[in-house]
């Protein structure tokens, strides 16, 4: 370690000679700046002393409230000004001052870079009293120094509300270069230039940088830190690191992988989550992204039917979440589904194709030729219809749903009846006389309820009327039919 020391004239006679070993020695872990608010003794100080400039770290008391006793000026002894040492070594430094015993209330504190060192574990204050003066030696020790211990250390003594400050002791911890910026992993486009940055500091300075690519040095001559390496382009993955050199030795940065962007791998595990008559919900597991984030995905759907023309429907969707609901499909149909995703380089191949089916749909047409008439007993309404011409995709007919609405004097009531698929007629009880009954019929399959037929109205007279004429579904374009009996 290198040390620098300065010797100057002392403003007050110091404790004479080496400190006598016979003197009582008191140790303290840390004496520090007191807070004396409300308790200041009335000892007064003048900022200057005739014939002597005020230096800022010398306390120059003049008179006391006891009358006329002049107190001598005080200052810390000059000590080593600069300590240079290697990382992980131990260091001990001190400041000392001789305080006449007339100063009966003093405290010492250590400060680093303008902040008081409150931790008590490093500092020891020793007192060597005799009849006239007490020599105070405040020592500060650091075991296994680190870079964070670098800085300017001072002692402060508070004495009768005046502060005396020692000269600074600069601690410089030297060690291997320390990286403040290391190269970062990157994903780059093939044959495209990119930059890597490396920065390291001492002390000691200077710090020189060598770049390493796949274990081989890139630059013959070192560059002063910080260094930027421009790589003109790569065709395959490479690993880069930098070496930082100073007089203490060499530190190697982490190795970073530079990847070449490529098209993604195809998605895997395309799964069916839910099928309805006209939609299929799918999910997939994205493939490797090719070192470039996915932008979007494409769901490709082919109808598996010997009679279809084999055209492919394409649905574009975001890359996340890895799920899509394919809509506008035909009921009870088989489809082959694949997924492809893209990044900035291009599209992946399509995933393995999977087969999926839609379920039965609801009928798309209503029953035909609906007729309604009041039977002879006048207690029932007879309804007749013809089976609708449903497509295969609607699935197997399971029955019919009949809606009949009764309206009389501002009151309306709807009732629903279900009948089996083998029927093409039904009979419903008269609910209200002197009322209009409106009937509609829908075909029902496992896929759901189809559209209702156009309404057919029949008037149910009061008791004693005779006419039994039917009502029927109108020809297309006619208004709602109604038969008044």
């Amino acid at each position: 370690a290198i040390t620098e020391a300065r010797e100057e004239a002392k403003p007050y006679p110091l404790f004479p000679g080496p400190l006598p070993g016979s003197l009582q020695t008191d140790h303290t872990s840390l004496l520090s700046l007191p807070h004396t608010s409300g308790y200041q003794p009335a000892l007064m100080f003048s900022p200057t002393q005739p014939g002597r400039p005020y230096t800022g770290n010398v306390a120059i008391p003049r008179v006391t409230s006891a009358g006329s006793k002049l107190l001598p000026p005080l200052a810390f002894k000059h000590t080593v000004g600069h300590i240079i040492l290697s990382e992980h070594k131990d260091v001990k430094f001190n400041c000392s001052i001789s305080v006449p015993n007339i100063y009966q209330d003093t405290t010492i504190s250590w400060w680093k870079d303008g902040k008081e060192l409150l931790g008590a574990h490093h500092a020891i204050t020793q007192f060597y009293p005799d009849d006239e003066v007490t020599a105070i030696i405040a020592s500060f020790s650091i075991t296994s120094v680190q870079r964070s211990d670098n800085g300017s250390y001072i002692c402060k003594m508070k004495i009768n509300n005046e502060e005396i400050v020692s000269d600074p002791i600069y601690i410089e911890v030297q060690g291997l270069p320390h990286f403040t910026k290391q190269p970062e992993s990157m994903n780059v486009t093939r044959n495209t230039a990119f930059n890597l940055t490396c920065q390291a500091v001492g002390p000691p300075e200077p710090v020189n940088i060598f770049w390493v690519q796949n274990s081989s040095r890139v630059n013959e001559q070192p560059e002063k830190s910080p260094s930027v390496l421009t790589v003109p382009g790569l065709t395959e993955m490479a690993v880069f690191s930098c070496e930082a050199h100073n007089d203490k030795g060499l530190t190697v940065s982490k190795g970073v992988q530079i990847n070449i962007k490529a098209i993604p791998s195809p998605p895997t595990e395309v799964s069916i989550h839910n099928s309805t008559a006209h939609s299929i919900l799918i999910s997939w597991v994205p493939g490797f992204d090719g070192y470039s984030p996915f932008r979007n995905c494409s769901v490709q759907v082919k109808e598996v039917d010997p009679l279809s023309n084999g055209s492919v429907m394409i649905f574009n969707t975001s890359a996340s979440p890895h799920m899509y609901q394919i809509k506008q499909l035909q009921a009870l149909a088989n489809y082959s589904i694949g997924v492809s995703c893209m990044n900035e380089i291009g599209w992946s191949a399509v995933s393995p194709w999977i087969l999926a089916s839609t379920t039965e749909g609801a009928p798309s047409v209503a029953p035909l030729n609906v007729t309604v008439f009041l039977n002879e007993s006048r207690d029932n309404v007879d309804i007749r219809w013809m089976k609708p011409l449903t497509k295969r995709q609607a699935g197997e007919l399971v029955g019919y749903r009949i809606s009949h609405v009764w309206q009389s004097a501002g009151i309306s009531k709807e009732l629903l009846e279900e009948v089996g698929q083998n029927n093409s007629r039904a009979q419903i009880s008269v609910q209200v006389h002197n009322a209009t009954c409106t009937v509609r019929i829908a075909a029902v399959t496992k896929g759901g309820v189809g559209p209702f037929s156009d309404p057919v109205k029949i008037f149910i007279p009061a008791h004693g009327w005779v006419d039994h004429a039917p009502s029927s579904t109108p020809a297309p374009g006619n208004a709602d039919p109604v038969l008044i009996i």
């Epitope: 009582q24 008191d26 140790h27 303290t28 872990s29 840390l30 004496l31 520090s32 007191p34 807070h35 004396t36 409300g38 308790y39 003794p41 009335a42 000892l43 006391t64 409230s65 006891a66 006793k69 305080v99 015993n101 007339i102 100063y103 009966q104 209330d105 003093t106 405290t107 010492i108 409150l118 008590a120 204050t125 007192f127 009293p129 009849d131 006239e132 007490t134 105070i136 003594m157």
Partner: antibody
Framework: QVQLVQSGSELKKPGASVKVSCKAS????????MNWVRQAPGQGLEWMGW????????TYADDFKGRFVFSLDTSVSTAYLQISSLKAEDTAVYYC?????????????WGQGTLVTVSS | DIQMTQSPSSLSASVGDRVTITCRAS??????VAWYQQKPGKAPKRLIY???NRHTGVPSRFSGSGSGTEFTLTISNLQPEDFATYYC?????????FGGGTKLEIK
């Protein structure tokens, strides 16, 4: 060796005054400040303040400002505590205690104590 | 003002035991804590200064430790003459303040 010898017990009436002395020997009197500590019967210790034996400058704790006065006679190495307008609650043992070395505020030597009893 | 909270307020132990008394400061007092022993009718006696330093003539069975706000006085191998009341004192900040005391009694 260092010794602090205090004056004897006092019995006083409320409203009276008392002066307790603390005579130092075995060291340079003006090199160490003198503290005063009170201990009421069956109670703990209470710091009253201190006096700079070189300058004569006293420092009082808040509870002891007013009726309590610290003084010195350096020619006979003696510190004094005077209490005026005594009250029953002033009944206590009063100790003088020497400040340790410069730059520290603990006490290293104590007087034997003076019992002041205030009773009508 | 800095409060010094001493615990326990009383303690029973036997000769040969090891006992620990604690003082907690209401704010950081660095190592500016002293410990005193007082026997009935007598003046306090110095034991420890600056948290961990034994005064001259104090037996080695007395030890102090701590810094900041937590301080302990430990007496190992208790002797008959150690049964007394013990006080801590913070001398970091004016006004100086004592703990409430710990009375150590024979079990």
């Amino acid at each position: 060796q260092v010794q602090l010898v205090q004056s004897g017990s006092e019995l006083k009436k409320p409203g009276a005054s008392v002066k307790v002395s603390c005579k130092a020997s075995g060291y340079t009197f003006t090199n160490h400040g003198m503290n005063w500590v009170r201990q009421a019967p069956g109670q703990g210790l209470e710091w009253m303040g201190w006096i700079n034996t070189y300058t004569g400058e006293p420092t009082y704790a808040d509870d002891f400002k007013g009726r309590f006065v610290f003084s010195l006679d350096t020619s006979v190495s003696t510190a004094y505590l005077q209490i005026s307008s005594l009250k029953a609650e002033d009944t206590a043992v009063y100790y003088c205690a020497r400040k340790g070395v410069t730059a520290a505020r603990y006490f290293d030597y104590w007087g034997q104590g003076t019992l002041v009893t205030v009773s009508s | 003002d800095i409060q010094m909270t001493q615990s326990p307020s009383s303690l029973s132990a036997s000769v040969g035991d090891r006992v620990t008394i604690t003082c907690r400061a209401s704010q950081n007092v660095r190592t500016a804590v002293a410990w005193y022993q007082q026997k009935p009718g007598k003046a306090p006696k110095r034991l420890i200064y600056l948290a961990s330093n034994r005064h001259t003539g104090v037996p080695s069975r007395f030890s102090g430790s701590g810094s900041g706000t937590e301080f302990t006085l430990t007496i190992s191998n208790l002797q008959p003459e150690d049964f007394a009341t013990y006080y801590c004192l913070q001398h970091w900040n004016y006004p100086l303040t004592f703990g409430g005391g710990t009375k150590l009694e024979i079990k």
